[in-house]
């Protein structure tokens, strides 16, 4: 026996109250597959959230961060503040990274300057706060009297950050 | 959509090697870090360590250094987790999860038994 | 590194208030974040960065977080919260992040 509620479209719900006939979704609310006994209530984009997409009576809306956020979890659940490069996050706002560690993204925190010295490299460019060192060839491969820059450079353990 | 797959269920032997795996899609891989997380049986989360992909730079905490090694692959995607030698004290699922202090996603969990 | 303390276990009446505290030394010089876990599942976050509720979280979950402790508030608590909840921290001393033990809640 077929359930009389299979029938009733996306966009639809199966009214127990009236004798199972299939009624619209009510404002704010959405059915997205057929069948179903209930519309789910529309998601709402407040506070640093705002609307992709509106809500329809078939599916629901999306979300995503106002500009200075960006979106983390499913369906952009949750928004986290983005800060420069060359920053980190902390609970007091956006931190310059401390020497020795860079960040060249809007997001995440700051990590440590490479250590050519470990790989028997020497220093071809110095880090900053936006980007890493890079590494050149070994001090043994240069020829004489050429000079490469070579700062003291932290070995590649997480350092203290500012907070 | 964004996943992290991790790979299957192991039983292992006292003293072998392990290498699980966890596969990351539907975003830029290189540029989140990805944690692993210990889960004992009946027990709580403990937090191991992480990894930035785009550099493989890691860090681990205290409790798991030198016990085991994390390290990553962008070009495929997949970081891995690593032992040398396992104990019957490594029995327990361990998942990986995209981030440093908000996971927002988590691998399915893999399994690991050691036992003789 | 920091420690993170939680009651092994909360009890609460169907449409009561359960609340499971998290302390730590200065944990409120940090964000605390909250997850649920339920049997055979990973966990999932129900509160981030002391207070904030990603979405299709129910409203009934709140976070606040000052001095030393952190607490998850689950207000009109319902049978389908029951669950492991753990808070969590990120530390810039040492770049680690920490679990708290966890606390089982148990709906009556």
């Known amino acids: 026996l077929q359930d009389p509620c299979s029938k009733c479209p996306a966009g639809t719900f199966c009214d127990n109250n009236r004798n199972q006939i299939c009624s619209p979704c009510p404002p704010n609310s959405f059915s997205s597959t057929s069948g179903q006994k209930a519309c789910d209530i529309c998601r709402q984009c407040k506070g640093v959230f705002r609307t992709r997409k509106e809500c329809s009576s078939t599916s629901n809306a999306e979300c995503d961060c106002t500009p200075g956020f960006h979106c983390l979890g499913a369906g952009c659940s949750m928004c986290e503040q983005d800060c420069k490069q060359g920053q980190e996050l902390t609970k007091k706002g956006c931190k310059d990274c401390c020497f020795g560690t860079f960040n060249d993204q809007k997001r995440g925190i700051c990590r440590p300057w490479t250590n050519c010295s470990l790989d028997g490299k020497s220093v071809l460019v110095n880090g900053t706060k936006e980007r890493d060192v890079v590494c050149g060839p070994s001090p043994a491969d240069l020829s004489p009297g050429a000079s490469s820059v070579t700062p003291p450079a932290p070995a590649r353990e997480p350092g203290h950050s500012p907070q | 959509q964004v996943q992290l797959v991790q790979s299957g269920a192991e039983v292992k032997k006292p003293g072998e090697s392990l290498k699980i795996s966890c596969k990351g899609s539907?975003?830029?891989?290189?540029?989140?870090?990805i944690s692993w997380v210990r889960q004992m049986p009946g027990k709580g989360l403990e937090w191991m360590g992480k990894i930035y992909p785009g550099d493989s730079y890691t860090n681990y905490s205290p409790s798991f250094q030198g016990q085991v090694t994390i390290s990553a692959d962008k070009s495929i995607s997949t970081a891995y987790l690593q032992w040398s030698s396992l104990k019957a004290s490594d029995t327990a699922m361990y998942y990986c999860?995209?981030?440093?202090?908000?996971?927002?996603?988590w691998g399915q969990g893999t399994l690991v038994t050691v036992s003789s | 590194d920091i420690e993170l303390t939680q009651p092994p276990s909360v009890s609460v009446a169907p449409g009561q208030t359960a609340r499971i505290s998290c302390s730590g030394d200065n944990i409120g010089d940090q964000y605390a974040h909250w997850y649920q876990q339920k049997p055979g599942q990973a966990p999932v976050v129900v509160i981030y960065q002391d207070k904030n509720r990603p979405s299709g979280i129910p409203e009934r979950f709140s976070g606040s977080n000052s001095g030393n402790t952190a607490t998850l508030t689950i207000s009109g608590t319902q049978a389908e919260d029951e669950a492991d909840y753990y808070c969590?921290?990120?530390?810039?001393?040492?770049?680690?992040?920490?679990f708290g033990g966890g606390t089982k809640l148990t709906v009556l």
């Open positions: 999860a995209r981030g440093y202090g908000i996971f927002d996603y």
């Open positions: 969590s921290t990120y530390t810039f001393v040492g770049f680690t992040t920490v």
């Open positions: 539907g975003y830029s891989f290189s540029t989140y870090w």
